[in-house]
Interface confidence: medium
Amino acid sequence: FDNYYGADNQSECEYTDWKSSGALIPAIYMLVFLLGTTGNGLVLWTVFRSSREKRRSADIFIASLAVADLTFVVTLPLWATYTYRDYDWPFGTFACKLSSYLIFVNMYASAFCLTGLSFDRYLAIVRPVANARLRLRVSGAVATAVLWVLAALLAMPVMVLRTTGDLENTTKVQCYMDYSMVATVSSEWAWEVGLGVSSTTVGFVVPFTIMLTCYFFIAQTIAGHFRKERIEGLRKRRRLLSIIVVLVVTFALCKMPYHLVKTLYMLGSLLHWPCDFDLFLMNIFPYCTCISYVNSCLNPFLYAFFDPRFRQACTSMLLMGQSRCAGTSHSSSGEKSASYSSGHDYKDDDDKHHHHHHHHHH
């Protein structure tokens, strides 16, 4: 039953569930796949090229963010095909489970990574001396391990409950959440709403609230200490801060429509939206999802646009590539220049200064 015709007392709505966007959304997905694999691959390459001692506490979160985006964007050709085939899944149940799982792992992991980056900047700027130990590489590694385990566990219901089937007795196979193993027909919607609300809360609302809190205190501190600080140190610190703020704002702008529409749709079962509003939500949701997915290829471009040192690292890498092709030998300094860390103020003055400060106290 592809088409539903909505009958209200006053109005009529034509339902075409998940109306096909034609080639637009699949084309965007393929573009995100191409840009996301190369861009995030480049970020990882530049981070891991640098020597360990040159890496800073924020590095591990930037690398994790790239890994999260990279593991997700590799599934986009499957979702592009699904959308292009007007929501007909030809890849089997396991691919449906795994690629859906990776969407949610990415959603949680990227939110947690940005929270980690924001908290790292909070510690560096607001509480530099007291929390120097917190920002050491070991605690960064522990935090990253925790965030990945948490993301993997929180996404597990998707791995378990996603399946494939012909829901509307047509020839099309959907990749959907099947609650029949955990819920009765009557309680299925409660599971749908429960998991939907919890994923939005844990994967967006809570992390974003923590990020905003961090930036509130950071803004207070920067405003308060503007005249007291050494201009050079402040400039270096604010450069990295501005990059992370841009990442967070972009994340919010990309994810907000998706979470908002999903929440409004679920509220519909309680508030009984009129037919045309429900139809509107269903028709814009694929575009909101698309915008959400675009976020996974944007971060490398944000680094490149807002950080001259990342551009330097990329340029050095390109030059190295050209000289390799020409058969030229490289100096070790040339190798090191193509690192994200060395070119990113990853050991900026405030880090060095406060670590020394910390040691003097002991």
Partner: nanobody
Framework: EVQLVESGGGLVQPGGSLRLSCAAS????????MGWYRQAPGKGREFVAA???????SYADSVKGRFTISRDNSKNTVYLQMNSLRAEDTAVYYC???????????????????????WGQGTQVTVSS
Amino acid sequence: EVQLVESGGGLVQPGGSLRLSCAASGLTFSSHCMGWYRQAPGKGREFVAAISGSRGYSYADSVKGRFTISRDNSKNTVYLQMNSLRAEDTAVYYCAAVPRAGIESGAYCKWSYKDSGSWGQGTQVTVSS
């Protein structure tokens, strides 16, 4: 537990009208898709009409223009208005309720669940002169 109770069936002459009702309990009515199926003597169960949680609807080709499905969420009831009845409409009419998928799964009505037990006992409609 889901309970669906049909009423309104009976004997009617060809060209006549009937209005079937199905009262549902034990489910979040507005988030379910409701449908009517029928089973004629010696035949399999066939789809008649369906209505989604948002009052969107669909019909079998054989009843289009003659039957109208509607729902009242405040009363947890779905209706089937049957006009211009024919002899071939004679059957036991069953009410069915299936969950509607979440928006991330396409908001489809899960009609593949129709064998999962959320059926009424049925109401007999006989069209005969």
